[in-house]
Amino acid sequence: EEELQMIQPEKLLLVTVGKTATLHCTVTSLLPVGPVLWFRGVGPGRELIYNQKEGHFPRVTTVSDLTKRNNMDFSIRISSITPADVGTYYCVKFRKGSPENVEFKSGPGTEMALGAKPSAPVVLGPAARTTPEHTVSFTCESHGFSPRDITLKWFKNGNELSDFQTNVDPTGQSVAYSIRSTARVVLDPWDVRSQVICEVAHVTLQGDPLRGTANLSEAIRVPPTLEVTQQPMRVGNQVNVTCQVRKFYPQSLQLTWSENGNVCQRETASTLTENKDGTYNWTSWFLVNISDQRDDVVLTCQVKHDGQLAVSKRLALEVTVHQKDQSSDATP
C-alpha cells in the first residue's frame, strides 16, 4: 500500500489584487478514508479556507470534481483576492475518526503573496544637448511593483550597456517598490538615429519585460563643419560663392553672409538635405557682383547652430583680370 503524499507543487504563488488564485494540491493515494481540508497558517489558530462537506466558502471553488470516485486533485480557486488573503496555504488530509476526524498529513504549503506589476518604465534624458564624444546620463523609473526582486537592463541600439547604477526603494518591507536607474552613455556622431532602452523584468510579467525608450536625437548636438568655396564659373558679372554646412543636428540653424564685414540682407538661395545618419547638410549660394572697384572682397559665412556661439568661414574672393575683362565685356 503506497504511503499518502500531499503534493503542493508551488512554494510561492504570486497573485494580483482582484484576480483569482489557484492553489494546487494532489494526493498520491485514496487511503486513509477522510476529507481533505484547506487551511491558512498552522496551529490552533489556523484559518479554515475550504471544507467540501460543511461550512460556507463562497469565494472558493474546486478545480476538479471532488465528488468523483477516484479523485486525487484537491486544488482550489479563491476569487477576488485582497491583501488580507496573503499567507501560507496548506491542504491537509484527515482520517475519519470518532469523536473527531484526525489530522493525518499536511502538504508542505504554498505561500500566497501579492504581486504587483511594475509601471511602464519612463526614460528621461539630459536637460541640455551634448556633443559627440561626451557622456550623457539617462534615468529610468518604474513604480508600484511587488515583490522587491526586479531586473533592469540598459541597451543602446540593441547592445547591452554596463555603465549604470540602480536603486530599489524602500530597502525594508513594503507593499510596493520603486526602481530608479541611471545609465551613462557616450555619444557617437552617428547617434542621431540611436535609441536607449530601459528593460524591466519582473516575476509578475511572466517573461514579457516592459521597455521604456529615449531617442538620443533629444540629447545630442552635432556641430556643423563649414566650407566656403568659390565657383570657377561666373554668371554675367556675378561670381557664385557656396557655403556648405555639413553634418549638423538638430536642424535649428541661422546662416548669414557678410561682405567685407557688412552683413548682407539680400535673399540667397539655399537647400537643406538630410543624411542617412539623421544629420543635415545646408548649402547656401551667394552671388557677388564683380566690378573694377572691387579688388579685394572678403566673404564670410557665419552659422549660428542651435543657440550656440556662431562659427564662421571666410573666403577672399579671387577675381582675375580675365574675369574682370569678361565681366566688362558682358556689361552692355
Epitope: 484559518e47 462537506k53 460556507h56 469523536p99
Partner: antibody
C-alpha cells in the same frame, strides 16, 4: 438553486416514534454533511447531529444519542431524522440543513396524548 | 462540550442606534468556525455572518462581526426596523456543535 424540502407537521403520541424527511434539490446530498437542529417554541437552537451521506457516518450530540437516528438515501437525495420514545419534551420544530449554510423550512412535531 | 452564552437575552434598540450582541464561549473557538444566524418569527434561521466577520450574501453592510478565542460579537452600526429578529451564534469547531441561547432584538 439549493433547496431543502422537509416533510409535513406530525402529531404523535407519547412513546411513539416519528421519521422526518428532508429532500434536497440543486445538489447531491452525498457531497455535503446533512445536519439536524431542534428548536422548541420561543427557545434556542439545539444541534442534534449530522450524517455524511457518502458513507453513512454519523455524529450526535450526547443529549440526542439514543433519541435520534439520522440516515440518508442518496438515490432519492433525502436525509431522515427518526425520533423514538417521544415525550412532550420532543415537541419542537426540527430543521435540516446542508453543511450549516442552507436550511429547510422546518417540520413541527407535536407530542400529545 | 463548548457552551456558548449570548447576552443580552433580549434587548430593544431605537432606529439609528448602534447595537452590539455578544457571544462568549466556555473554551476557545477558532474564528473560522464561529457563525451567526438571524431568525425571524415563523421562518427558518438564515446564515448571517460566517467565519466570525464575513457577511453572508444579501446581509446589509451595517452588520459586522468580530472576535477571537472565547469572545465574539455582532454589531449593527445603525439599527433599522428590519433588523428586529433573533440572532444565534454557533460553533462548529468541535463536536458536539453548539448554539448560543440567542438574543432577541426588538425595535423601540
Amino acid at each position: 438553486e439549493v433547496q431543502l424540502q422537509q416533510s409535513g407537521a406530525e402529531l404523535v403520541k407519547p412513546g411513539a416514534s416519528v421519521k422526518l424527511s428532508c429532500t434536497a434539490s440543486g445538489f447531491n446530498i452525498k457531497d455535503y454533511y446533512m445536519h439536524w437542529v431542534k428548536q422548541r417554541t420561543e427557545q434556542g437552537l439545539e444541534w442534534i447531529g449530522r450524517i455524511d451521506p457518502e458513507d453513512g457516518e454519523t455524529k450526535y450530540a450526547p443529549k440526542f444519542q439514543g433519541k435520534a437516528t439520522i440516515t440518508a438515501d442518496t438515490s432519492s437525495n433525502t436525509a431522515y431524522l427518526q425520533l423514538s420514545s417521544l415525550t412532550s419534551e420532543d415537541t419542537a420544530v426540527y430543521y435540516c440543513d446542508r453543511g450549516l449554510a442552507y436550511w429547510g423550512q422546518g417540520t413541527l412535531v407535536t407530542v400529545s396524548a | 462540550q463548548i457552551v456558548l452564552t449570548q447576552s443580552p437575552a433580549i434587548m430593544s434598540a431605537s432606529p439609528g442606534e448602534k447595537v452590539t450582541l455578544t457571544c462568549s464561549a466556555s473554551s476557545s473557538v477558532s474564528s473560522s468556525y464561529l457563525y451567526w444566524y438571524q431568525q425571524k418569527p415563523g421562518s427558518s434561521p438564515k446564515l448571517w455572518i460566517y467565519s466570525t466577520s464575513n457577511l453572508a450574501s444579501g446581509v446589509p453592510a451595517r452588520f459586522s462581526g468580530s472576535g477571537s478565542g472565547t469572545s465574539y460579537s455582532l454589531t449593527i452600526s445603525s439599527m433599522e426596523a428590519e433588523d428586529a429578529a433573533s440572532y444565534f451564534c454557533h460553533q462548529w469547531s468541535s463536536y458536539p456543535y453548539t448554539f448560543g441561547g440567542g438574543t432577541k432584538l426588538e425595535i423601540k
